[in-house]
C-alpha cells in the first residue's frame, strides 16, 4: 500500500522546517504545508501565481478527498461544481447551475424540469387522479327524507400531485341534482319545533318556486291542493327527464 | 468515446515475467489516476495497483507488492504493469481503468495463465 | 483494510420481480461507495456512485441506498438484461475493497 516512489521530504526545499503551525506535519516559507499531520488533508490553494499548502480536517467547498496511504488528498471538482464525488460525477452545483446525472447544466434538457429547491433537473410529474367514487345518495341539507329534489356527489383523489411543469389536477368533486320519490321524514330525523320553523321558512320558499325554475325546495304545501301538486309534481318529472337526457352536471371543483 | 486497450497478455510459466500494456483515449489521460484490477476465473474483482496522475506515486495490493511495479508515460497515454516472479495464483483477467476513488472507465481485459 | 461483505452470494429471479442486494462494510465509510454490474466475459460497468446517485445511461429501475456501514442495491423491476453479477465497492480510503459479488440468475 505504501507508496513506492516520489515522498515528500524534509530535504525537498531549503527551507522546511518542523515548527509549523495549522496541521502542518513539515512546511517551508514559500509552499506553506508540505505534508500534514495524521487524518488531516492537503491542499493547494493558488494565491496569486504561487500555491500554499494547506491542512484542514475536511476538503472545503469545490473539492473532494482522497485518502491514499500516505496522504489525504484534496483535489478539486470541476468549476461550476460545488460538491464533488470525483472528477467525474458532481453531486451539488454551484448558485445558478442544475444537478443532471452528476454534471451540472445552465439549464434542464428537453422533458426535465428544474428543482428549485434542490436545484436539479427532475422527470416532470403529471396529476394522477383516482376513479370516481360511486354517487352519494341523494340529500338535501344532510337529510335523505322530506324533499323530491336534491343533490348528489361523487368525489377522487389525487393519487400524484404534479410537478411545477405537469398537468393540473382535475376537479376532485362533482355534483348534480337529483329527484327522488318523495318520502316524509320519521319523528327520529327532525324535532317539533324544527319542523313548524322549517315549515314557515318552506312555504316561502314554494311561493318563490311557482314563479321560478330553481330547484324545488320544499315540503309539502300547505297552499297547494293535491291536484296542484301532482300537476307539479308531473311537470317537474318531464324538465328533470329532459335535463336528464342532455347529461347536465354541475362540477364543483377541488383542483389540487 | 473513452477508450482503453489492454495488451501484454499470454501463457507464461510460474517464475517468467510479463509486461502488460493499457492504451487510453478519450479521455484526459494525465489528469486521472490509472490503476490495474485483476479477476481470477471464476471469482470476483481484486485491485492490484494505482498509480497517480503524474507518476510521482504508486499503491500496490498486498498480494503483488514486491514483484509487480506500475507506470505510466503521459506523453503516449499509456499505462504500464511489469509483472515478475509470476505465480500460478496470478491467473486472471487484468484490467486497466481509471481511478478516481471509482473505477470509472474500464478497458476490456487481457488473460494472463501461469502455467506450467 | 475495509471488509465488505455482500449477500446473497447468488439470486435466482424472474422479470418484474423486486430484487436487493445488500453490502455490509467494517467500518463507517459515510456515502464513499459504488456499485458495479458485470456481464459474462465483459469488464464491470459502473452503475451506482456516492451510494445514491444514477451513472449517465443507468435505467431509473436501479436504485441504491444507505449510508456508514449498510448499503443496498435494489432492482424495482427485474428486466431480462439486468441478469449479471453486481459488485460493491467503498471508495473511502485506500486499498479499495469490494465486494465478493452477487450473480443474479433466471428462476
Known amino acids: 500500500q505504501n507508496a513506492s516512489r516520489g515522498r515528500r521530504q524534509r530535504r525537498m526545499h531549503p527551507n522546511v522546517s518542523q515548527g509549523c503551525q495549522g496541521g502542518c506535519a513539515t512546511c517551508s516559507d514559500y509552499n506553506g504545508c508540505l505534508s500534514c499531520k495524521p487524518r488531516l488533508f492537503f491542499v493547494l490553494e493558488r494565491i496569486g501565481m504561487k500555491q500554499i499548502g494547506v491542512c484542514l480536517s475536511s476538503c472545503p467547498s469545490g473539492y473532494y478527498g482522497t485518502r491514499y496511504p500516505d496522504i489525504n488528498k484534496c483535489t478539486k471538482c470541476k468549476v461550476d461544481c460545488d460538491t464533488c464525488f470525483n472528477k467525474n460525477f458532481c453531486t451539488k452545483c454551484k448558485s445558478g447551475f442544475y444537478l443532471h446525472l452528476g454534471k451540472c447544466l445552465d439549464s434542464c434538457p428537453e422533458g426535465l424540469e428544474a428543482n428549485n429547491h434542490t436545484m436539479e433537473c427532475v422527470s416532470i410529474v403529471h396529476c394522477e387522479a383516482s376513479e370516481w367514487s360511486p354517487w352519494s345518495p341523494c340529500m338535501k341539507k344532510g337529510k335523505t327524507c322530506g324533499f323530491k329534489r336534491g343533490t348528489e356527489t361523487r368525489v377522487r383523489d389525487i393519487l400524484q400531485h404534479p410537478s411545477a411543469k405537469g398537468n393540473l389536477c382535475p376537479p376532485t368533486s362533482e355534483t348534480r341534482t337529483c329527484i327522488v320519490q318523495r318520502k316524509k321524514c320519521s319523528k327520529g330525523e327532525r324535532g317539533k319545533k324544527g319542523r313548524e320553523r322549517k315549515r314557515k321558512k318552506l312555504n316561502k320558499e314554494e311561493r318563490k318556486e311557482t314563479s321560478s325554475s330553481s330547484d324545488s325546495k320544499g315540503l309539502e304545501s300547505s297552499i297547494e291542493t293535491p291536484d296542484q301538486q301532482e300537476n307539479k309534481e308531473r311537470q317537474q318529472q318531464q324538465k328533470r327527464r329532459a335535463r336528464d337526457k342532455q347529461q347536465k352536471s354541475v362540477s364543483v371543483s377541488t383542483v389540487h | 468515446e473513452v477508450q482503453l486497450v489492454e495488451s501484454g497478455g499470454g501463457v507464461v510459466q510460474p517464475g517468467r515475467s510479463l509486461r502488460l500494456s493499457c492504451a487510453a483515449s478519450?479521455?484526459?489521460?494525465?489528469?486521472?489516476?490509472m490503476a490495474w484490477v485483476r479477476q481470477a476465473p471464476g471469482k470476483g474483482l481484486e485491485w492490484v495497483a494505482t498509480?497517480?496522475?503524474?507518476?510521482?506515486?504508486?499503491y500496490f495490493g498486498d498480494s503483488v507488492r514486491g514483484r509487480f511495479t506500475i507506470s505510466r508515460d503521459n506523453s503516449k497515454n499509456t499505462l504500464y504493469l511489469q509483472m515478475n516472479s509470476l505465480r500460478a495464483e496470478d491467473t486472471a483477467v487484468y484490467y486497466c481503468?481509471?481511478?478516481?476513488?471509482?473505477?470509472?472507465?474500464w478497458g476490456q481485459g487481457t488473460m494472463v495463465t501461469v502455467s506450467s | 483494510d475495509i471488509q465488505m461483505t455482500q449477500s446473497p452470494s447468488s439470486l435466482s429471479a424472474s422479470v418484474g420481480d423486486r430484487v436487493t442486494i445488500t453490502c455490509l462494510v467494517s467500518?463507517?465509510?459515510?456515502?464513499?461507495f459504488v456499485w458495479y454490474q458485470q456481464k459474462p466475459g465483459k469488464a464491470p460497468k459502473l452503475l451506482i456512485y456516492?451510494?445514491?446517485r444514477l451513472q449517465d445511461g443507468v435505467p431509473s429501475r436501479f436504485s441504491g441506498s444507505g449510508s456508514g456501514t449498510d448499503f443496498t442495491l435494489t432492482i424495482s423491476s427485474l428486466q431480462p438484461e439486468d441478469f449479471a453479477t453486481y459488485y460493491c465497492?467503498?471508495?473511502?480510503?485506500?486499498?479499495?475493497?469490494f465486494g465478493q459479488g452477487t450473480k443474479l440468475e433466471i428462476k
Open positions: 481503468t481509471a481511478h478516481d476513488r471509482s473505477f470509472d472507465y
Open positions: 456516492a451510494a445514491s
Open positions: 465497492q467503498q471508495s473511502y480510503k485506500y486499498p479499495p475493497t
Open positions: 498509480i497517480i496522475y503524474d507518476g510521482s506515486r504508486a
Open positions: 467500518e463507517d465509510i459515510s456515502n464513499d
Open positions: 478519450g479521455f484526459t489521460f494525465s489528469d486521472y489516476d
